[in-house]
Interface confidence: low
């Protein structure tokens, strides 16, 4: 699945011929249970994000909203396949759903991975433009640019994930009782180049889907943090409070992304390096055994974003509250305004910010107040 990782069976490395591999110790119901939990939370949470973004009026949407919506769509399209993967895992890796669903659901995993990462990179760059270069790059951040960038990222994600659609298949590789959903390079690779394809696709996937975007994100947040720190040095006590909160959000965004995806990419890379570096058998076996859990952690990322919004963004909480109690008369009047406020919390367009000198919660702000301080910087 990941899958690979998701990748085909590998026979080549000499070091592996000496390793005593045991039959896969199934995680039992743990991974399937997590998948189902991610499915439930992910569909609800990402559905809620889409609902709050799209129910706000067009004028109130900003350039960042399109990335947030895309992120939710990417996560949502992926999490709906999780019941299939939960079943596959629970059945001890026996795929009963046919070849097309194997191809499609595997494809969606990687489309989600690329689209999510690109959305986060887009949001990070959008934040960078908004905070570090708010005036010079105002034109770059128009809604049209956001739409074009989103279209590009989706096309890119769809193309980069295409090898999975091409090579994934179902087959009974070793016995007659279980059908696996796996990568089959035999149509393009000889025996000797099988591993080269696996390594090539694996390394390029990690580079394009993690290393490069993560480097861009870190660079963006480095300059953002630098700018915020510079501005806040000029602020008084209220500014110090905001500095702590804004910087903590930035740290949480980067750390959450890294925590969820780093184990997957790290273990995958180490496993592939094994053919060159000849890891000790115990370490090689450890990598193989830990990989499903790394995959599981990376999938959890698809349901975390809404919780991060809810935890760090009071306006998103308001929007959720307004939806939850919109049927009650006492909330009915606040429903629309709350979602409008929420829209602003995701926004990044300072060309049409709220009323003069009004910050979060309607606080009066200092004359010297930086233009982005009315916004929450939650981007993941």
């Amino acid at each position: 699945m990941e899958e690979g990782g998701d990748f085909d069976n590998y026979y080549g490395a000499d070091n592996q011929s000496e390793c005593e591999y045991t039959d896969w110790k199934s995680s039992g119901a743990l991974i399937p249970a997590i998948y189902m939990l991610v499915f439930l939370l992910g569909t609800t949470g990402n559905g809620l994000v889409l609902w709050t973004v799209f129910r706000s009026s067009r004028e109130k949407r900003r350039s960042a909203d399109i990335f947030i919506a895309s992120l939710a769509v990417a996560d949502l399209t992926f999490v709906v396949t999780l019941p299939l993967w939960a079943t596959y895992t629970y059945r001890d890796y026996d795929w009963p759903f046919g070849t097309f669903s194997c191809k499609l659901s595997s494809y969606l995993i990687f489309v989600n991975m690329y689209a999510s990462v690109f959305c986060l990179t887009g949001l990070s760059f959008d934040r960078y433009l908004a905070i570090v270069r708010p005036v010079a790059n105002a034109r770059l951040r128009l809604r049209v640019s956001g739409a074009v960038a989103t279209a590009v990222l989706w096309v890119l994600a769809a193309l980069l994930a295409m090898p999975v659609m091409v090579f994934r298949t179902t087959g009974d590789l070793e016995n007659t009782t279980k059908v696996q959903c796996y990568m089959d390079y035999s149509m393009v690779a000889t025996v000797s180049s099988d591993w080269a394809w696996e390594v090539g696709l694996g390394v390029s996937s990690t580079t394009v889907g993690f290393v490069v975007p993560f480097t861009i994100m870190l660079t963006c947040y480095f300059f953002i943090a630098q700018t915020i720190a510079g501005h806040f040095r000029k602020e008084r006590i209220e500014g110090l409070r905001k500095r702590r909160r804004l910087l903590s959000i930035i740290v949480v965004l980067v750390v959450t992304f890294a925590l969820c995806w780093m184990p997957y990419h790290l273990v995958k890379t180490l496993y592939m390096l094994g053919s060159l570096l000849h890891w000790p058998c115990d370490f090689d076996l450890f990598l193989m055994n830990v990989f499903p859990y790394c995959t599981c952690i990376s999938y959890v990322n698809s349901c975390l974003n809404p919780f991060l919004y809810a935890f760090f963004d009071p306006r998103f909480r308001q929007a959720c509250t307004s939806m939850l109690c919109c049927g009650q008369s006492r909330c009915a009047g606040t429903s629309h305004s709350s979602s409008g406020e929420k829209s602003a919390s995701y926004s990044s367009g300072h060309s049409q910010g709220p009323g003069p000198n009004m910050g979060k919660g309607g606080e009066q702000m200092h004359e010297k107040s930086i233009p982005y301080s009315q916004e929450t910087l939650v981007v993941d």
């Epitope: 699945m1 990941e2 899958e3 690979g4 990782g5 998701d6 990748f7 085909d8 069976n9 590998y10 026979y11 080549g12 592996q16 011929s17 390793c19 005593e20 591999y21 045991t22 039959d23 896969w24 596959y88 895992t89 001890d92 890796y93 026996d94 009974d172 590789l173 070793e174 016995n175 007659t176 009782t177 279980k178 696996q180 959903c181 796996y182 990568m183 035999s186 025996v191 000797s192 099988d194 694996g202 273990v267 995958k268 496993y271 990598l287 193989m288 055994n289 990989f291 499903p292 995959t295």
Partner: antibody, heavy 129, light 107 residues
Framework: EVQLVESGGGLVQPGGSLRLSCAAS?????NYWMSWVRLAPGKGLEW???????????YYVGSVKGRFTISRGDAKNSLYLQMNSLRAEDTAVYYC??????????????????????WGQGTTVTVSS | DIQMTQSPSSLSASVGDRVTITCRAS??????LGWYQQKPGKAPKRLIY???SLQSGVPSRFSGSGSGTEFTLTISSLQPEDFATYYC?????????FGQGTKVEIK
Amino acid sequence: EVQLVESGGGLVQPGGSLRLSCAASGFTFSNYWMSWVRLAPGKGLEWVANIKQDGSERYYVGSVKGRFTISRGDAKNSLYLQMNSLRAEDTAVYYCARDRFGYSAFDKGVRYYYGMDVWGQGTTVTVSS
Amino acid sequence: DIQMTQSPSSLSASVGDRVTITCRASQGIRNDLGWYQQKPGKAPKRLIYAASSLQSGVPSRFSGSGSGTEFTLTISSLQPEDFATYYCLQHNSYPRTFGQGTKVEIK
């Protein structure tokens, strides 16, 4: 030292039964699939049967299905082949062999197969009246 | 069942010769094939697994190649201890099947 030692062979009449044993040492027996392979006089090697670690999967060549049963006793590090309704064509040297399997981490479940890497010296079964 | 056809069934060669044995599967078996060496009265010994991967401890003069239906075992320079019978084994599907064997004799 990794070692497999077969026993239980002998002379048996057609229609009779025999139970072959294979004692394993030098490796974690419960971690491996195990196989039986035979070599009939003047013929080539023939794979007979194999069994998964926990006994949940067993496979047989068509000519022995319903007559032979492969089993294992992990506590005794032993592999067994119960042979019933023996025929003259079952006459052969029977080898037990260790099967090497692993998993591709990235497909989590796709088994790759190394083949039979450790063999015993064999035990002779003669079916004759 | 997948039939494995080995050729030649026997061959005579001298020490230092390059020897090639082929194995043909009745249907595609990817690279799910191994090569085994057996000497009279001895247990078989695995030389190659997965069509081309050399078993640890086996001299590098042995090599395997092929994928799909055509496979080859090559001994680059025949040594006295290499005179034996060689078998290919497919493990792509059950029942596993061996080739009929190739006996390599001294010329």
